[in-house]
């Protein structure tokens, strides 16, 4: 007996040969002896019911005169999985269909950190193993259902499982998208007084996009985190709901998600939540967003610089005068120069010598009253 | 071709009413935005209100807001706007537009002419 | 509400010139930035969207650059049908607001 692979929903192709490699009289039939198509010498295809129903099974007429009388069997079912006979020169082959199918638990948009469910139907009497590859190449096996936890955006795009069953294979492809934002964390570094944009692009594209999203912000200085803004989001057109007075926020209109603060200033500086919470899906997106903003200062005879904001202990804090070395360099947010000498001063903030954030300041000669005799 | 025809301008005294609409062909009517956009004589373009595509939010500039209605109806392909409290400076040209799928009022009609006077 | 500022308000160019109009937003609007171009007793006619994109059958003659704060409208080679008003429209959020206007005449 023959066995053949099909996929539901895809065509299966069931081989009868002839020994003659000519056109001959062949007929398919189901086991119980139902006639499903053949060809009695005409060379004219003759089925064996209503159109209707038997409009998913055909032959290759070109392959006819070659001695091949395939039964193709199109948009496969789950019940197609049965014997199937071809009679032919006085015998009778019999060849074995077994349709599978493997489906994505519930959804194939599923949010970051969600688990992933695939499961594999097969026909009874059959014991495939199941393997699927992820698009990040790793590999997980199973019985008839395959589960991966903790989803990550590495793991959005097509998915491979290879269904094995009597040293045959039939290879699924489903397209899995992750939801999530491009970035799960971002900073920005910006001097007191300059304007700041907060950008929260996704990384997936829908053709319609509905939700509702809220930016909270736990500044620095603040005992408690505040609702900066809150927006809906429908199909993909972003519309603010309620905005703080201070800060004044200014929201755009279209994806990516786009937020515009006028001014940094020390007591904004701090770290921000965005959640997204996208209609017909548990569970929200989320990005951290940081702010960090520098002061420089000079107040009587001290020169003064401060950063405000969630800094990493290695970054450095140095006061230097322009195109010197460094006056005073520290693992500190808040650093100063007494008596600094006249020219441009610069404050600056970096990381393994790359800077992140500068900030210049003229000192201006100080004129001292010469003291009389 | 994507059309679209403004109908309903005219003279009005102060604190009148007045309600435009505008005829869209072409296109797909439902699912764009579609705006009112105005031009006072010899001066530059001022946006007046947008309602977005079958949502149905809606949008108005602050000289306007509480005074006019932007609506549409979309079995009819027609985009209205509703003017109450009509003041002298709501005098202009009034274009209809609509939006692209980019958000961009890409199309505009050749604009009926309101007239607030006593 | 954000502001728009274009500059020049009006210039005077011969047919061939390359003309540049700049347009100024009062905070950052990334590329949601538009250009419309009015002839007089007419409706305004849309040329370039996203501060780049040239709107289908615009002559290639128009380009478009800028991103934030600052935006560029640039005819390379003035024909006579460009004597025209160009206006910048921010398109970043509500209320949408468009530049004064630049005048585009003939030397």
């Known amino acids: 007996k023959t066995l053949v692979l099909g996929k539901e929903g895809e065509s299966a192709e069931l081989p009868c040969e002839s020994s003659q490699k000519k056109i001959t009289v062949f007929t398919w039939k189901f086991s119980d002896q139902r006639k499903i198509l053949g060809q009695h010498g005409k060379g004219v295809l003759i089925r064996g019911g209503s159109p209707s129903q038997f409009d998913r099974f055909d032959s290759k007429k070109g392959a006819w005169e070659k001695g091949s009388f395939p039964l193709i069997i199109n948009k496969l079912k789950m019940e197609d999985s049965q014997t199937y006979i071809c009679e032919l020169e006085n015998r009778k082959e019999e060849v074995e269909l077994w349709v599978f199918k493997v489906t994505a638990n519930s959804d194939t948009h599923l949010l970051q950190g969600q688990s992933l469910t695939l499961t594999l139907e097969s026909p009874p009497g059959s014991s495939p193993s199941v393997q699927c590859r992820s698009p990040r190449g790793k590999n997980i096996q199973g019985g008839k259902t395959l589960s991966v936890s903790q989803l990550e955006l590495q793991d959005s795009g097509t998915w491979t499982c290879t269904v094995l069953q009597n040293q045959k294979k039939v290879e699924f492809k489903i397209d899995i998208v992750v939801l999530a934002f491009q970035k799960a964390s971002s900073i920005v570094y910006k001097k007191e007084g300059e304007q700041v944009e907060f950008s929260f692009p996704l990384a997936f594209t829908v053709e319609k996009l509905t939700g509702s999203g809220e930016l909270w912000w736990q500044a620095e200085r603040a005992s408690s985190s505040k609702s900066w803004i809150t927006f809906d989001l429908k199909n993909k057109e972003v519309s603010v709901k309620r905005v703080t007075q201070d800060p004044k926020l200014q929201m755009g209109k279209k994806l990516p998600l786009h937020l515009t603060l006028p001014q940094a200033l020390p007591q904004y500086a701090g770290s921000g939540n965005l959640t997204l919470a996208l209609e017909a899906k548990t569970g929200k997106l989320h990005q951290e967003v940081n702010l960090v903003v520098m002061r420089a200062t000079q107040l009587q005879k001290n020169l003064t610089c401060e950063v405000w904001g969630p800094t990493s202990p290695k970054l450095m804090l140095s006061l230097k005068l322009e195109n010197k070395e460094a006056k005073v360099s520290k693992r500190e947010k808040a650093v100063w120069v007494l008596n600094p000498e006249a020219g441009m001063w610069q404050c600056l903030l970096s990381d393994s010598g790359q800077v992140l954030l500068e900030s210049n300041i003229k000192v201006l000669p100080t004129w001292s009253t010469p003291v009389q005799p | 071709e994507v059309q679209l025809l403004e109908s309903g301008g005219g003279l009005v005294q102060p604190g009148g009413s007045l309600r435009l609409s505008c005829a869209a062909s072409?296109?797909?009517?439902?699912?764009?935005?579609m705006s009112w956009v105005r031009q006072a004589p010899g001066k530059g373009l001022e946006w007046v209100s947008t309602?977005?595509?079958?949502?149905?939010?809606?949008y108005y500039a602050d000289s306007v807001k509480g005074r006019f209605t932007i609506s549409r109806d979309n079995s009819k392909n027609t985009l209205y706007l509703q003017m109450n409290s009509l003041r002298a400076e709501d005098t202009a040209v009034y274009y209809c537009?609509?939006?692209?799928?980019?958000?961009?009022?890409?199309?505009w009609g050749k604009g009926t002419t309101v007239t607030v006077s006593s | 509400a954000i502001q728009m500022t274009q500059s020049p308000s009006s210039l005077s160019a011969s047919v061939g010139d390359r003309v540049t109009i700049t347009c100024r937003a009062s905070?950052?609007?990334?590329?949601?930035l538009g250009w419309c171009q009015q002839k007089p007793g007419k409706a305004p006619k849309f040329l370039i969207y996203?501060?780049?994109t040239l709107q289908s059958g615009v002559p290639s003659r128009f380009s478009g650059s800028g991103y934030g704060t600052d935006f560029t409208l640039t005819i390379s080679s003035l024909q006579p049908e460009d004597f025209a008003t160009y206006y910048c429209?921010?398109?970043?959020?509500?209320?949408?607001?468009f530049g004064q206007g630049t005048k585009v005449e003939i030397k």
């Open positions: 072409g296109f797909t009517f439902s699912t764009y935005a």
């Open positions: 996203a501060a780049s």
């Open positions: 429209l921010q398109d970043y959020n509500y209320p949408r607001t």
């Open positions: 309602i977005s595509d079958n949502i149905g939010n809606t």
């Open positions: 537009t609509k939006d692209n799928e980019d958000y961009y009022m890409d199309v």
């Open positions: 905070q950052g609007i990334r590329n949601d």
